[in-house]
Every structure is written in structure tokens, then in C-alpha cells.
């Protein structure tokens, strides 16, 4: 006899690191029927939800309207269906950026690059912090971590054109505060070529947001709940 | 066309530090690295470090961290290396090298250490 | 760090002459290689970048190309002004390594 239902989708909208002062809402997905959704923040109950009608609900929704500190962490939730429980969700790890500096991020040989060829990326920030975090924009928002006083340094070895994207770096006061994302970078990868000995024309970025590369809507979210709190976890453990 | 002015010489004397310059021109100096490398007479290329003008980022040679010191000043568009307590070991040519793949190289300064 | 290993370090040869020059890498630097060329009064100039790009104004003689760890410069007929030094220069990883040099002689 199943003594708990199956645990819930948790993910977070737009995504999972939020500028200080922004919106956030974290999303919960369990079972049509389910008639309580709790959220856990660090451990203890957040907040509560109960659907109505149950049974043309499978998710709910928990609205954070000013993001800062003390609301960034660990988060999972559970749902009820009659008096059975379900497993808890994977934990969400929500992170606030925007924090005090800005770190610059640089890459050596340079932005535009040769199949082939080795690439470091650079990311410098003068501020008290040991931690640092490269994202290469994208569906997946693949993450790297590393560490140094001042600045860290991101080997990339050998790159193809699938390393092609923009690249942008945080600074990390701790696993859930980050300081403002670096300006972007945006990484070129040719195959070989004949001839650019002379310097490739400065590359120029949009003034946008890096919001840019963050889900903002449902499509094709179901399929990548289970991708974000893989790499929320990779990241923040 | 892209340039690297370096000074042909400088003399310095034992312990004393020397701050080598590098003035750039004909390309916009802050978007690329700049390298600094040793050649001792009649010997080999050692590469000391580099230095991002505009993230400041740097990155050394672990032989020259306690000898070398890479600054830029943007405004004149100049990369500067400080040599300290110096030796006969670090009588060479010195020279700046712009971009990632050392694509352009200053015409180099000879340091002499002497008494 | 990276070595490379660079022969041989002297060669003797006649103008019109093929030569090659190699540099053998002590650990994987992907295509991250260049050959440089020094002259007498202390000039370095840049020939090939990235193992086998060549540099704007290079003479289509001068040629780069990898085999596994190994990089090797080809000069395909030898001119006057070739009878320079040479040197491989890996900046795949920090700290960038040189090749301890070539010194092309006429013969």
C-alpha cells in the first residue's frame, strides 16, 4: 500500500536567481486533487496554499514581491491529497543578485576564437568575496564555480562551436547572494581560418538585461523542471 | 596601424626598482591583453605576465609574482611594469605584446643592472 | 607548467631549401600554438597563430600544422631573409611557455 504520493515539480519564475527587490514566484506542481500545498524555506514551513477547486488544480504558486537576503535559500514543497502526503520536492535554490559590485569578465585569447584553440575566461571583482560563478546564457544556464582572492579563472579547454554564447560572471557573498552579473561577453568560435591577424573589431553587446536568457514562460517548462533544480543543486552544492 | 612604444633603455642600479612603459596606439587599447615577456642576452622568450586594461584583470608567471607588478593607465592608453629589487639576473629585454595570441610586440627595452 | 620542447636548435641550410622546424608539447594545448621570428636587432614578429593560421603579410612559404603533440613550422624555399631565429610560443594554459628557439643558418 503506497504510504506517499509522488513527490512535486518545484521551480521558480522567472528563474532561479532573482535581483534584489524584484518579483519572484515559486511554483509548485503535485496532482489535480491535491487539496493543501505547503512551501519550506531552510527546513520550516513558509507558507500555504489550498486550491480551489482541487480537482481542476495540479499547481499552485507562491508570489515573493521584493526579493532580498533573507528570502534567498533553500526551498521545497509538498502537497496532500486527503490525508496522504507526498514525498518532499527537490530542494529550489533560490538566489539573490544584485548585491553591492559588479565584477568585469575578460577572456584570453579574446572573444573571438579558433576551433581548437584553449580559452580561459576571467572574472574580477575587488569586493570581499572567494567565490565566483561563469553562466553561459541559455535554456540550460550551465554554471561553473570557481575561486580566488580577486578574481577566478575559468579554463575551457579546447573549444568548439558549441561554446559559442555569452558568457556573464557573479561574484558570490555566499551559495545564495550574488553581486550584479558581469557585462556580457560574448564568445565567437569560427573554424579554422586564413587570415584575421589584424584585431577583430571591438565586439558589441546589447544594453539589454541579462534577463534575457531567463524562462519567462510555461512552454516547455514541464520538460525542464527537473533540468533547473539539477543545476540549481550542481551549482549550490 | 597598431604600435607599442617602448623606451630603448633604461640603467638601474642593484636593489633599486625601474617602471618599464608601453604606449599603445592604433587600436582600442582596452579591449585586449597585454603581455609582458624577458629575454635575457643571447637566451630564450619568458613570458611574465598579462594584463587586461579594462577589467584589470592579471594573471603572472609565478617566477616574476614577487618581481613584477602590471598597471595600466586607460587615459594614455600606456601599460606600465614595475621591477623591484633588482639584480644582474634581471638585466634583459623586456618587451610589451599586445592581444591574446601575441600578435604585436613592442620593440622591446634593455634593462642593465649595474653598480 | 606546459614545456615545449623545440628542434632542432640550429640548422643549416641553402636558399631554395625546404625545412621544417617542430615544437613537442608536454601536455594537450589543443591548437593554441604560434610561431614567432626574431631578428638579429632583437624585432619579433608573428607568423602563425592558432598552429595554422597565417599572420596578414606573411609570405605563403611559411606554414604551420599539428600532428598530435607535435607543431611544426615549414618554410617551402628558403630566401635570404629567413636566416632568423624561431621560436614556438603555447598559450593554451598560463603561465605561456616558449620553445628554448631555432636558429636557421645558411649554409
Known amino acids: 500500500q503506497q504510504q506517499t504520493l509522488p513527490k512535486p515539480f518545484i521551480w521558480a519564475e522567472p528563474h532561479f536567481m532573482v535581483p534584489k527587490e524584484k518579483q519572484v514566484t515559486i511554483c509548485c506542481q503535485g496532482n489535480y486533487g491535491a487539496v493543501e500545498y505547503q512551501l519550506h524555506f531552510e527546513g520550516s514551513l513558509f507558507a500555504v496554499d489550498r486550491p480551489k477547486p482541487p480537482e481542476r488544480i495540479n499547481k499552485v504558486q507562491f508570489y515573493i514581491p521584493d526579493m532580498n537576503s533573507r528570502m534567498a535559500g533553500q526551498y521545497s514543497c509538498i502537497y496532500r491529497v486527503g490525508e496522504l502526503w507526498s514525498e518532499p520536492s527537490n530542494l529550489l535554490d533560490l538566489v539573490v543578485t544584485e548585491m553591492y559590485d559588479t565584477p568585469t569578465l575578460s577572456v584570453h585569447p579574446g572573444p573571438e576564437v579558433i576551433s581548437g584553440e584553449k580559452v580561459t575566461f576571467y572574472c574580477r571583482l575587488d569586493t570581499a568575496t572567494s567565490m565566483f560563478l561563469l553562466l553561459k546564457e541559455g535554456r540550460s544556464s550551465h554554471v561553473q564555480r570557481g575561486y580566488g582572492k580577486v578574481q577566478a579563472e575559468f579554463p575551457l579547454g579546447p573549444v568548439t562551436t558549441a561554446h559559442r554564447g555569452t558568457y556573464r560572471c557573479f561574484g558570490s557573498y555566499n551559495n545564495h547572494a550574488w553581486s550584479f552579473p558581469s557585462e556580457p561577453v560574448k564568445l565567437l568560435v569560427t573554424g579554422d581560418i586564413e587570415n584575421t591577424s589584424l584585431a577583430p573589431e571591438d565586439p558589441t553587446f546589447p544594453a539589454d538585461t541579462w534577463g534575457t536568457y531567463l524562462l519567462t514562460t510555461e512552454t516547455g517548462l514541464q520538460k525542464d523542471h527537473a533540468l533547473w533544480d539539477h543545476t540549481a543543486q550542481n551549482l549550490l552544492r | 596601424q597598431v604600435q607599442l612604444q617602448q623606451p630603448g633603455a633604461e640603467l638601474v642600479k642593484p636593489g633599486a626598482s625601474v617602471k618599464l612603459s608601453c604606449k599603445a596606439s592604433?587600436?582600442?587599447?582596452?579591449?585586449?591583453?597585454m603581455h609582458w615577456v624577458k629575454q635575457r642576452p643571447g637566451q630564450g622568450l619568458e613570458w611574465i605576465g598579462m594584463?587586461?586594461?579594462?577589467?584589470?584583470?592579471?594573471n603572472y608567471n609565478e617566477k616574476f609574482k614577487s618581481k613584477a607588478t602590471l598597471t595600466v593607465d586607460k587615459s594614455s592608453s600606456t601599460a606600465y611594469m614595475q621591477l623591484s629589487s633588482l639584480t644582474s639576473e634581471d638585466s634583459a629585454v623586456y618587451y610589451c605584446?599586445?592581444?591574446?595570441?601575441?600578435?604585436?610586440w613592442g620593440q622591446g627595452t634593455l634593462v642593465t643592472v649595474s653598480a | 607548467d606546459i614545456q615545449m620542447t623545440q628542434s632542432p636548435s640550429s640548422l643549416s641550410a641553402s636558399l631554395g631549401e625546404r625545412v621544417s622546424l617542430t615544437c613537442r608539447a608536454s601536455?594537450?594545448?589543443?591548437?593554441?600554438l604560434n610561431w614567432l621570428q626574431q631578428e638579429p636587432d632583437g624585432t619579433i614578429k608573428r607568423l602563425i597563430y592558432?598552429?595554422?593560421s597565417l599572420d596578414s603579410g606573411v609570405p605563403k612559404r611559411f606554414s604551420g600544422s599539428r600532428s598530435g603533440s607535435d607543431y611544426s613550422l615549414t618554410i617551402s624555399s628558403l630566401e635570404s631573409e629567413d636566416f632568423v631565429d624561431y621560436y614556438c610560443?603555447?598559450?593554451?594554459?598560463?603561465?605561456?611557455?616558449f620553445g628554448s628557439g631555432t636558429k636557421l643558418e645558411i649554409k
Open positions: 605584446v599586445y592581444d591574446g595570441r601575441f600578435a604585436y
Open positions: 592604433g587600436y582600442t587599447f582596452t579591449s585586449y591583453w
Open positions: 594584463i587586461h586594461p579594462n577589467s584589470g584583470s592579471t
Open positions: 601536455q594537450d594545448i589543443g591548437s593554441s
Open positions: 592558432a598552429t595554422s
Open positions: 610560443l603555447q598559450y593554451a594554459s598560463s603561465p605561456f611557455t
